[in-house]
């Protein structure tokens, strides 16, 4: 059944980081264009992305009003040109998307380092607050702010001279490392979610800075 | 527990508007939607509209479009279902009803009687 | 938009007897289909959601089934209180629109 001429929406899938969430699907719309609906478990269907030719929805507005709820998404498809009366009693053909729990499975985004800074045998290692979308009193929160100590982040060092690799482990997003008096290091990190149990539960590392380049400062003592 | 408690029965002439109320308590106003749905004597059930308190968002069965108004006032966890251009046909008992999921109402108010009549 | 046709549109029982009351959607609803219980002068009272799930606090003799577009509401043994009218209602896609109603009254 469905509307003359129309293919319903298939291979939903969500795509997600920091919170900013799309909502994709298939086929490209040959003579049809597609509506998004979307709901909580516990609220009602809202329209989006009108009659759109594209085959991607940007849902993050919706979802980012409470990240720890389940969201359901549709998408409808409409023959081109015929969307608002098709002078047909049918309801358009549509398909579900898998359900979507922003806070559990949104992924992390690549971390960056903000700064470093050397005093004597000690560096203090800086993860530079990602921005999210996600609001509370008309401020946007940071990804700190969302994930409190749910986040952690691990960070990777090791001597420019060498490869051996050490690791640290903060729940804030500072670290505070020993190295050797002399020598240069290098950085790398990577958030963390230690409660999630699924692929979605690392970043991708940090780019990587040196120390004796311009994002530190060494200070002898 | 939750409540909904409506304002009280109205009569209007044909022509009027009438501003129906909806007072929720035992819950967060703003995490669930507010329906509206009416009855007239011996019918049976009408779904109007619902509203989305967290940002005013509303969609109405096409009936009703252009002549029904649904609007929140979160600071007082107040639902407002307004029906303009009332004609004898309108005669009714309105009722909200608190949404729990995509078209399911568990929570109802008592109901308002809107009499149209010259 | 979604019609909904139950039927009977009325029945008469007597309290210990088995009742089914059936429900037809105008097409797949894909079983967001709701049950309600309204007596004279009182607001409806959920009972049934998502075509088979029992909504808190109502007696387990009432049961729903169905898939697609078509559903049923069975009350096994039927009690004093239960002499109602009932409206089954979609939940699938705005406008959501109920049955006609069905009636069930004392034989």
């Known amino acids: 059944s469905g509307t003359t001429n129309t293919v319903a929406a298939y291979n939903l899938t969500w795509k997600s980081t920091n919170f900013k969430t799309i909502l994709e699907w298939e086929p490209k719309p040959i003579n049809q264009v597609y509506t998004v609906q979307i709901s909580t478990k516990s609220g009602d269907w809202k329209s989006k992305c009108f009659y759109t030719a594209d085959t991607e929805c940007d849902l993050t507005d919706e979802i980012v009003k409470d990240v720890k709820q389940t969201y359901l998404a549709r998408v409808f498809s409409y023959p081109a040109g015929h969307v608002e009366s098709t002078g047909s009693t049918e309801e358009p053909p549509y398909e579900n998307s898998p359900e979507f729990t922003p806070y559990l499975e949104t992924n992390l985004g690549q971390p960056t380092i903000q700064s470093f800074e050397q005093v004597g045998t000690k560096v203090n290692v800086t993860v530079q607050d990602e921005w999210t979308l996600v609001r509370r009193n008309d401020t946007f929160l940071s990804l700190r702010d969302v994930f409190g100590k749910d986040l952690i982040y691990t960070l990777y060092y090791w001597k420019s001279s060498s490869s051996g690799k050490k690791t640290a482990k903060t729940n804030t997003n500072e670290f505070l490392i020993d190295v050797d008096k002399g020598e240069n290091y290098c950085f790398s990190v990577q958030a963390v979610i230690p409660s999630r149990r699924t692929a979605n539960r690392k970043s991708t590392d940090s780019p990587v800075e040196c120390m004796g380049h311009e994002k530190g400062e060494s200070r002898e003592i | 527990q939750v409540q909904l408690v409506q304002s009280g029965a109205e009569v209007k002439q044909p022509g009027a508007s009438v501003k129906v109320s909806c007072k929720a308590s035992?819950?967060?106003?703003?995490?669930?939607?507010m329906h509206w749905v009416r009855q007239a004597p011996g019918q049976g059930l009408e779904w109007m509209g619902m509203?989305?308190?967290?940002?005013?968002?509303?969609t109405y069965a096409q009936k009703f479009q252009g002549r029904v108004t649904l609007t929140v006032d979160t600071s007082t966890s107040t639902a407002y279902m307004e029906l303009s251009s009332l004609r004898s046909e309108d005669t009714a008992v309105y009722y909200c009803?608190?949404?729990?999921?995509?078209?399911?109402?568990?929570?109802w108010g008592q109901g308002t009687l809107v009499t149209v009549s010259s | 938009d979604i019609q909904e046709t139950q039927s009977p549109s009325s029945l008469s029982a007597s309290v210990g007897d088995r009742v089914t009351i059936t429900c037809r959607a105008s097409?797949?609803?894909?079983?967001?289909l709701n049950w309600y219980q309204q007596k004279p002068g009182k607001a409806p009272k959920l009972l049934i959601y998502?075509?088979?799930r029992l909504q808190s606090g109502v007696p387990s003799r009432f049961s729903g089934s169905g898939s697609g577009t078509d559903y049923t509401l069975t009350i096994s043994s039927l009690q004093p209180e239960d002499f109602a009218t009932y409206y089954c209602?979609?939940?699938?896609?705005?406008?959501?629109?109920f049955g006609q109603g069905t009636k069930v009254e004392i034989k």
């Open positions: 009803a608190r949404g729990s999921g995509p078209g399911l109402f568990a929570y």
């Open positions: 035992g819950y967060t106003f703003t995490t669930y939607w």
């Open positions: 509203i989305d308190p967290s940002d005013s968002y509303t």
């Open positions: 097409q797949d609803i894909r079983n967001y």
């Open positions: 998502h075509t088979s």
């Open positions: 209602q979609q939940g699938n896609m705005p406008p959501y629109t």
